[in-house]
Interface confidence: low
């Protein structure tokens, strides 16, 4: 289409385009449910699927829930955008010791440099404070760590990064050879500050990290501990439990250490559009009283899959369809998948809209 000042009627006769007076160009009309990525889209690839609020379109074109930064020790670093998750980081004065996808599973307070040490690098959201001797060059030769009065330059002192772990009361003390000691002290041995910034947005590569409670000697019963409202998924990642905070949802099962919270529609409502561990859209029960079905699954599986009963089985209860034959269409590119399922409320593919020609071009 002409780029410079076409007349308004240049686009007439082509229903897939419209004239934008502001930019004085013919623009591609995104199909219903798709949204332009720029002011004047020129082609189908300039249109994208719209995800629900607090969801983003991931690299595989799937609507994925943005993480929440609602924990006290987290702050929002970047907001939830159409194509990227919200990113959370530890609040000022804390660093991330166990990273989670787009967030941090465990934040510790920055260490305070002990006497005789000064701050070499201040703590950040990703790294603990790095201390060095107050008098550079004076570095005692250490035959063993126990003999060192001060760590040598550039090393991180065993200062006591303090975990914020409101989830467990056992975080305050731990058994050590028959007695108890401050968990902070144990934590300083269990959790060294990372040498390089942990990669926010990626699962922690360190598999063990934090036990549920410091391991009694000789005990192998240690597993990674996630923060409240997170669970440990099969891949060993701390993953946010779904939230049932919507008015039409109630909690069915709580957020556990190894399984997500599950939500279901509140009494009097039925799930019309399911979502993992929850329901994306609840609707009032039809008068003919269909029932919500839970697909039975092996109890060991983490996700329960909810679905509404086949609406077609009770024609009088069918809240939906506007019928009509859809034309065949083709995609110009083999784009990655779109995710939005058979939902009336969670559209829409990024791949090609309905083609006007039957040639696939």
């Amino acid at each position: 289409f002409p780029q410079d000042r076409p007349f308004e009627d240049t686009c007439h006769g082509n229903p897939s385009h419209y004239y934008d007076k502001a930019v004085r160009r013919c623009c591609y009309r995104c199909p219903m449910g798709l949204f332009p990525t720029q002011q004047c889209p020129q082609r189908p690839t300039d249109c994208r699927k719209q995800c629900e609020p607090d969801y983003y379109l991931d690299e595989a074109d799937r609507c994925t829930a943005c993480v929440t930064c609602s924990r006290d020790d987290l702050v929002e670093k970047t907001p939830c955008a159409w194509n990227s998750s919200r990113v959370c980081e530890c609040r000022p004065g804390m660093f991330c010791s166990t990273s989670a996808v787009n967030s941090c599973a465990r934040c510790f307070f920055h260490s305070v440099c002990p006497a005789g040490m000064i701050v070499k690098f201040p703590g950040t959201a990703q790294k603990n404070t790095v201390c060095e001797p107050a008098s550079p060059g004076v570095s005692p030769a250490c035959a063993s760590p126990e003999n060192c009065k001060e760590p040598s330059s550039g090393t991180i002192p065993q200062a006591k990064p303090t975990p914020v772990s409101p989830a467990t009361s056992s975080a305050s003390t731990m058994p050590v050879r028959g007695g108890t000691r401050l968990a902070q002290e144990a934590a300083s041995k269990l959790t060294r500050a990372p040498d390089s910034p942990s990669s926010v947005g990626r699962p922690s590569s360190d598999p063990g990290l934090s036990p549920t409670q410091p391991c009694p000697e000789g005990s192998g019963d240690c597993r990674k501990q996630c923060e409240p409202d997170y669970y440990l998924d099969e891949a060993g990642r701390c993953t946010a439990c779904v939230s049932c905070s919507r008015d039409d949802l109630v909690e069915k099962t709580p957020c556990a250490w190894n399984s997500s919270r599950t939500c279901e529609c509140r009494p009097g409502m039925i799930c019309a559009t399911s979502a993992t561990n929850s329901c994306a859209r609840c609707v009032p029960y039809p008068i003919c009283a269909a029932e919500t079905v839970t697909k039975p699954q092996d109890m060991a599986e983490k996700d329960t899959t909810f679905e509404a009963p086949p609406l077609g089985t009770q024609p009088d209860c069918n809240p939906t369809p506007e019928n009509g034959e859809a034309p065949a269409s083709t995609s110009p590119t083999q784009s990655l998948l779109v995710d939005s399922q058979a939902s009336k409320t969670l559209p829409i593919p990024t791949s090609a809209p309905v083609a006007l020609s039957s040639t696939g071009k």
């Epitope: 595989a60 609507c63 086949p310 069918n318 369809p321 998948l337 939005s340 058979a342 090609a352």
Partner: antibody
Framework: EVKLVESGGGLVQPGGSLRLSCATS????????MNWVRQPPGKALEWLGF??????????EFSASVMGRFTISRDDSQSILYLQMNTLRAEDSATYYC????????????????WGQGTSVTVSS | DIVLTQSPASLAVSLGQRATISCRAS??????????MHWYQQKAGQPPKLLIH???NLESGVPARFSGSGSGTDFTLNIHPVEEEDASTYYC?????????FGSGTKLEIK
Amino acid sequence: EVKLVESGGGLVQPGGSLRLSCATSGFTFSDYYMNWVRQPPGKALEWLGFIRNKANGYTTEFSASVMGRFTISRDDSQSILYLQMNTLRAEDSATYYCARDPPYGNPHYYAMDYWGQGTSVTVSS
Amino acid sequence: DIVLTQSPASLAVSLGQRATISCRASKSVSASGYNYMHWYQQKAGQPPKLLIHLASNLESGVPARFSGSGSGTDFTLNIHPVEEEDASTYYCQHSGELPFTFGSGTKLEIK
């Protein structure tokens, strides 16, 4: 009971065309993405393509082997899925299945939970 | 396209024993914490039947002797204990990206 029944198969000459149908019942057809898969005699399954539902713009995706030659369409009012096959080749001879894509929510994981019995297509001169 | 390599091409297992079928993808089919691999059973003269979705989730009505595992590029279907009626060809299918592809199939024979 969910049912899918393919029809329209038969013998066709190379270069010819054929339109397969898949009549469905027992579920709300308009809600579902629908797939076509084929299987040459004694060989593996091959995914051909799918058509999304109305909420997702009725858009389609295809495998490279049939792109530009095959098109998929649907009639939600009749609960029928179609596969229009043009410029047929000998290697298109196979049993053709339509299959439903289960809409279990995010993520949409693109499996096929119900299949028809298949219709046989032979391309030969 | 992602190529799925199934092995073995065929196997014979005694009644009550374990059958293990492997499916290797030429590229990871895991994304956003999900493993986009599914398993189907096809008996002679019948259409395929979905057994497992997202690598490890058993479909409704499928016996618990079927189980799936794996992530990234390596996936496994296990059947234990094997029964007579399990004699079939088994296919893996990925949906990690377009186009979707199936594995070449593994034929299970019961001894």
